[in-house]
C-alpha cells in the first residue's frame, strides 16, 4: 500500500487515520527534504491533486481540510515543489478510512439443522460499517457456567460436540471495529428446542383426470423426528398471493397432498417443516412448478422443466428449483 513508501517527512490525520464517516477531518503534511525549502506543498487523493481547502501553516507544513468526508477508503500522499527541482518531490503517503461503529446485533438466532452436527448462529448486523468489523459469539452453559467464545466476521457454525455443558445455554454476540463496540441481548436456548428437521423436498406432481381433476404433490424428508408440522404454499405463477395448507406429518413414507386446481395453469409449490411445537421453521424448499393439463393427466417429475405437451400422452416434465425473492431462507 501507500504506507510502504520511503518518506521525506510525515503525513497525518486529525482526529485519527480511521474516523466516522461524515466527519470533518484535517490532513497534515510536513516536509523534511534535504536542501529544500518547499515553494509549495501539494496533496493528492487517490492520485488526483486536490485544489481547494489547503492552508500553508509554516515553511514546512500544510493542511488539507475535508468537510463531511464520505469515502470509505482513500490513499493520500503529499509532495513538495523544491527550488531547482524539475519534478515534485514525494513527501509521504497514508491510507485513510471512514466508516461507522457497529450497530447492536439483534435477532440473534441459533438453530441445529438435523444431521449437520453444528449449531448455526446468525444475527442482524445492522447497517454497513464500511470497515473491518468482527463478531464474538459467546456461548455460556446455564448448567456449568462455562463460557466459550467464537470469533467470526459473519455467522458461526459451532460443533454440537463442543457443547458439553448440558442442554441449556445463553448466547450473545459482541460486535467490534476500530470505531466502537456493541453487544446484543442474551438469547436463551435449549438444544432440543432448536432442531430444524432435515429438508422437505417436493419430488413430483401428478394431476388425475377424475370428474373433478385433482393434483397430487409427492414430498418427503429424511428426518428422524417423529412429530413434524409442515406447511405447503402454492399459487398460480401469475398471482401474488400464496395459499397455505398445514399438515401434521409422519415421514415414515412419502407424503401425498391433494389439491383441486384450475386447469391449464402453471402453479408453483413450496414446502417447509418444523418440529411440532418448536420455534424455528425450515427455509421454504426450492420452487416446484407444475402446469395443470386442460383435460389430459400430467405427471411432473423432478428434473428440468420443459413445459412441453403432447396431445393425448402423459409427458414427463422437469422442475427446476429456482430461487426467487419469495424463497428467502427464513427460519423464524
Amino acid at each position: 500500500g501507500i504506507t510502504n513508501i520511503n518518506c521525506s517527512g510525515h503525513i497525518w490525520v486529525e482526529p485519527a487515520t480511521i474516523f466516522k464517516m461524515g466527519m470533518n477531518i484535517s490532513i497534515y503534511c510536513q516536509a523534511a527534504i534535504k536542501n529544500c525549502q518547499p515553494r509549495k506543498l501539494h496533496f493528492y487523493k487517490n492520485g488526483i491533486k486536490e485544489r481547494f481547502q489547503i492552508t500553508r501553516i509554516n515553511k514546512t507544513t500544510a493542511r488539507l481540510w475535508y468537510k463531511n468526508f464520505l469515502e470509505p477508503h482513500a490513499s493520500m500522499y503529499c509532495t513538495a515543489e523544491c527550488p531547482k527541482h524539475f519534478q515534485e518531490t514525494l513527501i509521504c503517503g497514508k491510507d485513510i478510512s471512514s466508516g461507522y461503529p457497529p450497530d447492536i446485533p439483534d435477532e440473534v438466532t441459533c438453530v441445529i439443522y438435523e444431521y449437520s452436527g453444528n449449531m448455526t448462529c446468525t444475527w442482524n448486523a445492522g447497517k454497513l460499517t464500511y470497515i473491518d468489523t468482527k463478531y464474538v459469539v459467546h456461548v455460556k452453559s446455564l448448567e456449568t457456567e462455562e463460557e466459550q467464545q467464537y470469533l467470526t466476521s459473519s455467522y458461526i457454525n459451532i460443533s454440537t460436540d463442543s457443547l458439553q455443558g448440558g442442554k441449556k445455554y445463553l448466547v450473545w454476540v459482541q460486535a467490534a471495529n476500530a470505531l466502537g463496540m456493541e453487544e446484543s441481548k442474551q438469547l436463551q436456548i435449549h438444544l432440543d428446542d432448536i432442531v430444524i428437521p432435515s429438508a422437505a423436498v417436493i419430488s413430483r406432481a401428478e394431476t388425475i383426470n377424475a370428474t373433478v381433476p385433482k393434483t397430487i404433490i409427492y414430498w418427503d424428508s429424511q428426518t428422524t423426528i417423529e412429530k413434524v408440522s409442515c406447511e405447503m404454499r402454492y399459487k398460480a405463477t401469475t398471482n401474488q398471493t400464496w395459499n397455505v395448507k398445514e399438515f401434521d406429518t409422519n415421514f415414515t413414507y412419502v407424503q401425498q397432498s391433494e389439491f383441486y386446481l384450475e386447469p391449464n395453469i402453471k402453479y408453483v409449490f413450496q414446502v417447509r417443516c418444523q418440529e411440532t411445537g418448536k420455534r424455528y421453521w425450515q427455509p421454504w424448499s426450492s420452487l416446484f412448478f407444475h402446469k395443470t393439463p386442460e383435460t389430459v393427466p400430467q405427471v411432473t417429475s423432478k428434473a428440468f422443466q420443459h413445459d412441453t405437451w403432447n396431445s393425448g400422452l402423459t409427458v414427463a416434465s422437469i422442475s427446476t428449483g429456482h430461487l426467487t425473492s419469495d424463497n428467502r431462507g427464513d427460519i423464524g
Partner: antibody, heavy 117, light 107 residues
Framework: QVQLVQSGAEVKKPGSSVKVSCKAS????????ISWVRQAPGQGLEWMGW????????NYAQKFQGRVTITADESTSTAYMELSSLRSEDTALYYC??????????WGQGTLVTVSS | DIQMTQSPSSLSASVGDRVTITCRAS??????LNWYQQKPGKAPKLLIY???SLQSGVPSRFSGSGSGTDFTLTISSLQPEDFATYYC?????????FGQGTKVEIK
Amino acid sequence: QVQLVQSGAEVKKPGSSVKVSCKASGGTFSSYGISWVRQAPGQGLEWMGWISAIFGTTNYAQKFQGRVTITADESTSTAYMELSSLRSEDTALYYCARPLKQAFDYWGQGTLVTVSS
Amino acid sequence: DIQMTQSPSSLSASVGDRVTITCRASQSITDDLNWYQQKPGKAPKLLIYAASSLQSGVPSRFSGSGSGTDFTLTISSLQPEDFATYYCQQSYSTPLTFGQGTKVEIK
C-alpha cells in the same frame, strides 16, 4: 516554542460541573487540534476528546459522551473542557495536549480536579 | 475501541541495561503508534511517533519498531534519568487509547 498553560486546581461537589481552560502560546493555535487526556491518581492515561479549533469539529470518547464539552476560543487561543455530573471517580489530573504528527508533542502542566462531598 | 496491552507492567533494571517494552493492539493499527515517558508529577513526554520515528530532542538510545499489532520500545543503554513510566498510545482511531503503562525501576 509552543506552551500550553492550564487553569488552577479545582475542588467540586458530586453532581456539579467543572470547566478547565488551556491557553496556547508560541504557535498557531488554530492550525492544530487540542485533545484532553486525564489521569486518575496512580492510574494510566485516558483520552477524553478532541477539538479542531479552526473548524469547531469535536470528537469525544464514548465513555464521556453527553458529559463532556470541549470548546475553543480562537481570539484568545484558549481551549476549554467542561465535565458535568461529576462523581468521585472523576477525581484526576486533566491535561490538554496538542497533537502533531498524530502524537501529543506538547502538553499542559495538568489541572487537578478533586470531586468530594 | 482498540485495546492496547503493554508488557511487562513493571520491570527492574540497572544503569547500562538494554530494556525492551512491548505493546500489543487488539487489531491492526498500521504504524499509528506513539511512545511516551512520564515521571512522577510531570506531564507525559513524547519519545517516538509513527512507531519508529524519534521525536526531536529525544536521545538516540530510544528506538521504536513494529507495525500492525505488535510494537516494541527499546532503550539500548538505560540511564539514571530513564527511570519512569512508559506508555504506548494508538492514534489509528478514536477513541485514542493508551496502554496501561510500564514502570521501569532501579534494580
